[in-house]
């Protein structure tokens, strides 16, 4: 029993990626997850 | 078929507190995300809790977040609700809910359990 | 948070006719990245749980009758029911699913005159 199941995130951008309940802008190099994106293709919270 | 069936509600006093299980079957249930959501006396629809598929990441409006803790058993196919501190406003009907994999509307909703908080 | 306005809060309808109520929302549901509005209608018969009627503000859930057609964009939504049956009776919300927390409209209560 499906829902609309997406391979990808439908993002701009290469950047994206499923964290959560949403695709979010992953971190850049050497800074770690803070917390997920709230809203879909957002920036997640990095350190 | 989709199914999803609330149980454990009760009436509990003002401060006390209260687990939800929600079971679900007729799909991979460690593929979605889940939520709560109640549905107050007056009929309206309040969001109360959210954890992911995958690596659980847990979500909740600010009207909960303390009191409430969302959790999941996908060997057991179950969601909980544990809900501390709890309040007259805090009575209602409480549904799970199965999220949509890519719009994160409820797809799927559960028949309810109520929880009436009073002295 | 984003706050969902529904109007009007009750309508009563004879069959067959065409019904629209209105869904407003405090900041825009559209996604610039994927050009989708993130707003879903359910509709609520006495007695029972919500069901998905719509997704992504026009997008039907299977298995709905296409007499429920969704529209809008932005801001404004609408909800309208070409030609509105005995079983409609219900109550109707809309539930924004754009962004945390997840907000529904107050309802609106639909009567068959």
């Known amino acids: 029993q499906g829902g609309t199941r997406s391979p990808r995130c439908d993002c701009a951008g290469d950047f994206h990626k499923k964290i959560g309940l949403f695709c979010c802008r992953g971190c850049p190099a050497g800074h770690y997850l803070k917390a997920p994106c709230t809203e879909p293709c957002g920036n997640s919270t990095c350190l | 078929e989709v199914q999803l069936v609330e149980s454990g509600g009760d009436f509990v006093k003002p401060g006390g507190s209260l687990k939800l299980s929600c079971a679900a079957s007729g799909f991979t249930f460690n593929n979605y995300g889940m939520s709560w959501v109640r549905q107050t006396p007056d009929k309206r629809l309040e969001w109360v809790a959210a954890?992911?598929?995958?690596?659980?990441?847990?979500y909740y409006p600010d009207t909960v977040k303390g009191r409430f803790t969302i959790s999941r058993d996908n060997a057991k196919n179950t969601l909980y609700l544990h809900m501390s501190s709890l309040k007259s406003e805090d009575t209602a009907m409480y549904y799970c809910?199965?999220?949509?994999?890519?719009?994160?509307?409820?797809?799927?909703w559960g028949q309810g359990t109520t929880l009436t908080v009073s002295s | 948070d984003i706050v969902m306005t529904q109007s009007p809060s009750s309508l009563a309808m004879s069959l067959g006719q065409r019904v629209t109520m209105n869904c407003k929302s405090s900041?825009?549901?559209?996604?610039?990245?994927?050009?989708?509005?993130?707003l879903a209608w359910y509709q609520q018969k006495p007695g029972q749980s919500p069901k998905l009627l719509v997704y992504f503000a026009s997008s039907r859930e299977s298995g709905v009758p296409d007499r429920f057609i969704g529209s809008g964009s932005g801001t404004d939504f609408t909800l309208t029911i070409s030609s509105v049956q005995a079983e409609d009776l219900a109550d109707y919300f809309c539930q924004q699913h754009y962004s945390t927390p997840f907000t529904f409209g107050s309802g609106t209560k639909l009567e068959i005159k």
């Open positions: 954890i992911s598929s995958g690596v659980t990441y847990t």
């Open positions: 900041q825009s549901l559209l996604n610039s990245h994927n050009q989708k509005n993130y």
């Open positions: 809910g199965r999220h949509d994999d890519y719009g994160n509307h409820f797809d799927y």
